[in-house]
């Protein structure tokens, strides 16, 4: 007979049970796979020299045997010879020292019996009372079972633990949790009430936290102020330093860490809600406000330590978006309306002195006027932006004030207070002779070129005494020099400079006369 | 002549049904263990089913559990193969096959007879 087949002869041995105490017993056997079958047993006694039969008899009465030599456990086909569709009746026989004992004979449908399953599926994992909980769908048909568990941690090997008898369509098991390192568990199941019986293969890992989670290790990246006055926050996570065990590596669930973003919008501190708290997958939308981010993390047990950083305002400025008319009876500052219905935060301080509060006012819903403008007035009285200096102004518009990640930025500018006229007038204006015909023109720069985007040129103003003929020449805002060609000599000049605004224009300086000398030739 | 011939195949969607008859002639078959098996392309033949003598005891492949169904009619000299729930991966050419000796193996080759086969095409 080969030995991958059920032989259909007498056994080599003299088939009488010696009835002793020891022998073969929980003979169990199962289908493994769709053609595959195992059957495996105990031995009591001493193993040496001890051969032995896996018995098995057929519906028809015909009888057969494996021989396994020293081993107690077996496999074999469904190509072996023996009836896997109809019931058989199997034993085992087994032979030292002159001497047969036979185990109880367990009589079954082989292709009906299938081996106990691990926990399948999901295995659900919760807290309690410092200890680990978890709980699973019984297989089916498979109601009643011993369970066992293993876990190891990224430095140790598999420990083993005992979850009980388990007696209900699911099961569940108390396992120890560690504080501070991620565990991998595996859990195996055996039918209840047949010690003999095999074990289930291992589930797949279950991979657990610490108790604690980790402090999350993010960067972050802020995109460009897009057109709607928006730039996306985009958080590059990092891989947690969290070291894992060898069957927890890759992308296993369970382990993971959670993140969710608490946005806090510093800029502009009279609207209704600053705060806001989001989920990390869920990338917001900034204004180009200033912000706090704190990325707190959390696992499946619970919320961890926090990360907080700062995200500067953007400091892009729309130079010409903002108008503003300075009146007698106040200031009205105009800009590009929005949508119906949305509320505006105007938000002013003066530069150099970003580290103080900025002052904040925030409009009523408005619509737009006919002109498809926004407005916002303030009297002379109230002070605001009175002062002859420097101030930025941030505009900030939502049509759900409440929310916190739809505010965008309408604008941002610059605005020299006070008498802007008056206050930038250029001084220290000098001439010098250049050539022939020509003269240099140079002055001390304006007091609105401190803020950025406000003036908008220098006019250089030369009237010829003579003739009272007036030439006017802009000068880019950023020189404080020009020159003035085709002169005549002997014609007394007087020239001015002013410094103009997109919506102002300037004081003239004080006149500076000024003649070229008449060459005499030899 | 002893004869197996399946019917009853076809294009089928994915969840329909479709039903397979064996019809056995040339000598009585109500005696054998019956059974269905199925072959894809460039796969062995697979177990799909089996049902013996007196319909006492079924056996399914764990891949048509609860969506199959193995039945007899001696009196007509017929098996049938319920299928329910189809899908894709189901579609193959289904075979009939006997085992006159009891043999009660899910190997096709302790079969003795066998029919033609019947294509069945599962759509998505």
């Known amino acids: 007979c080969r030995t991958s087949e059920c032989c259909f002869q007498d056994p080599p041995y003299s088939d009488a049970d010696s009835g002793s105490a020891s022998g073969p017993r929980d003979l169990s056997c199962y289908r493994i796979s769709s053609a595959g079958y195992e059957c495996s047993w105990q031995y009591e006694g001493p193993t040496a020299g001890v051969s032995h039969f896996l018995r098995c008899c057929l519906s028809s009465g015909r009888c057969c045997y494996f021989a396994t030599g020293s081993a107690t456990r077996l496999q074999f086909s469904d190509q072996a010879g023996v009836s896997v569709l109809h019931t058989v009746t199997l034993w085992v026989e087994s032979w030292a020292r002159n001497r047969t004992e036979k185990s109880p004979e367990v009589t079954l449908q082989l292709y009906k019996s299938v081996k106990y399953k691990p926990p399948l599926g999901d295995i659900k994992v919760s807290k309690l009372a410092g200890q680990l909980r978890m709980e699973w769908e019984t297989p089916d048909n498979q109601v009643g079972a011993e369970v066992q568990f293993r876990h190891r941690t990224p430095s140790s090997s598999w420990k083993l633990g005992d979850c009980g008898p388990q007696d209900d369509d699911t099961e569940s098991c108390l396992c120890p949790l560690e504080m501070n390192v991620a565990q991998e568990f595996q859990l195996r199941r055996r039918r209840l009430g047949s010690q003999g019986s095999s074990w289930s293969k291992w589930s797949s890992p279950v991979c657990v936290p610490p108790e604690n989670p980790p402090q999350p290790q993010v960067r972050f990246s802020v995109e460009q102020l897009g057109r709607d006055g928006r730039r996306r926050l985009t958080l590059k996570e990092q891989p947690t330093q969290l070291e894992l065990p060898e069957g927890c590596q890759g992308p296993a669930p369970g382990v993971e860490v959670t993140y969710q973003l608490q946005l806090h919008m510093l800029s502009c501190p009279c609207k209704a809600k600053a705060t806001r708290t989001l989920p990390l997958e869920k990338m917001p939308y900034l204004s180009g406000a200033a912000y706090n981010v704190a990325v707190i993390s959390s696992n499946r047990f619970g919320p961890g330590p926090n990360q907080t950083w700062h995200i500067p305002a953007d400091t892009h400025t729309e130079p010409v978006a903002l108008n503003i008319s300075v009146g007698t009876n106040g200031t009205t500052m105009y800009w590009p309306a929005r949508a119906q219905s949305t509320t505006y935060c105007i938000e002013w301080q003066p530069v150099g002195q970003e580290g103080s509060l900025a002052t904040c006012n925030l409009t009523a819903p408005q619509d737009p006027d006919p002109a498809g403008m926004a407005t916002y007035s303030w009297s002379r009285e109230s002070g605001a932006m009175g002062q002859e200096k420097c101030y930025h102004i941030t505009i900030f518009a939502s049509a759900h004030p409440k929310k916190l990640t739809l505010w965008s930025t309408v604008l941002s500018t610059y605005h020299f207070g006070g008498n802007a006229s008056a206050a930038g007038t250029p001084h220290h204006v000098s001439v010098k002779n250049h050539s022939l015909d020509s003269v240099s023109v140079d002055w001390a720069p304006s007091l609105l070129s401190t803020c950025p985007g406000v003036l908008k040129e220098y006019v250089v103003r030369c009237r010829d005494e003579d003739s009272n003929q007036v030439s006017e020449h802009p000068v880019q805002p950023t020189e404080t020099q020009v020159t003035l060609s085709d002169l005549r000599a002997g014609v007394a000049y007087t020239v001015q400079v002013r410094a103009d605004t997109a919506w102002l224009r300037g004081a003239w300086s004080q006149p500076q006369r000024f003649s070229i000398k008449v060459q005499v030739s030899d | 002549q002893v004869q197996l011939v399946e019917s009853g195949g076809g294009l089928a969607q994915a969840g329909g049904s479709l039903r397979l008859s064996c019809a056995a002639s040339?000598?009585?078959?109500?005696?054998?263990?019956m059974a269905w098996f199925r072959q894809a392309p460039g796969k062995e033949r697979e177990f799909v089913a089996h049902?013996?003598?007196?319909?006492?005891?079924?056996n399914y492949a764990d891949s048509v559990k609860g969506r199959f169904t193995i039945s007899r009619d001696n009196a007509k000299n017929t098996v049938y193969l319920q299928m329910t729930r189809l899908k894709p991966e189901d579609t193959a050419v289904y075979y009939c096959a006997a085992d006159p000796d009891h043999f009660g193996t899910t190997w096709y080759q302790q079969y003795t007879y066998w029919g033609p086969g019947t294509q069945v095409t599962v759509s998505s």
């Open positions: 040339g000598r009585t078959f109500s005696n054998d263990d």
């Open positions: 049902i013996d003598r007196n319909a006492a005891s079924t």
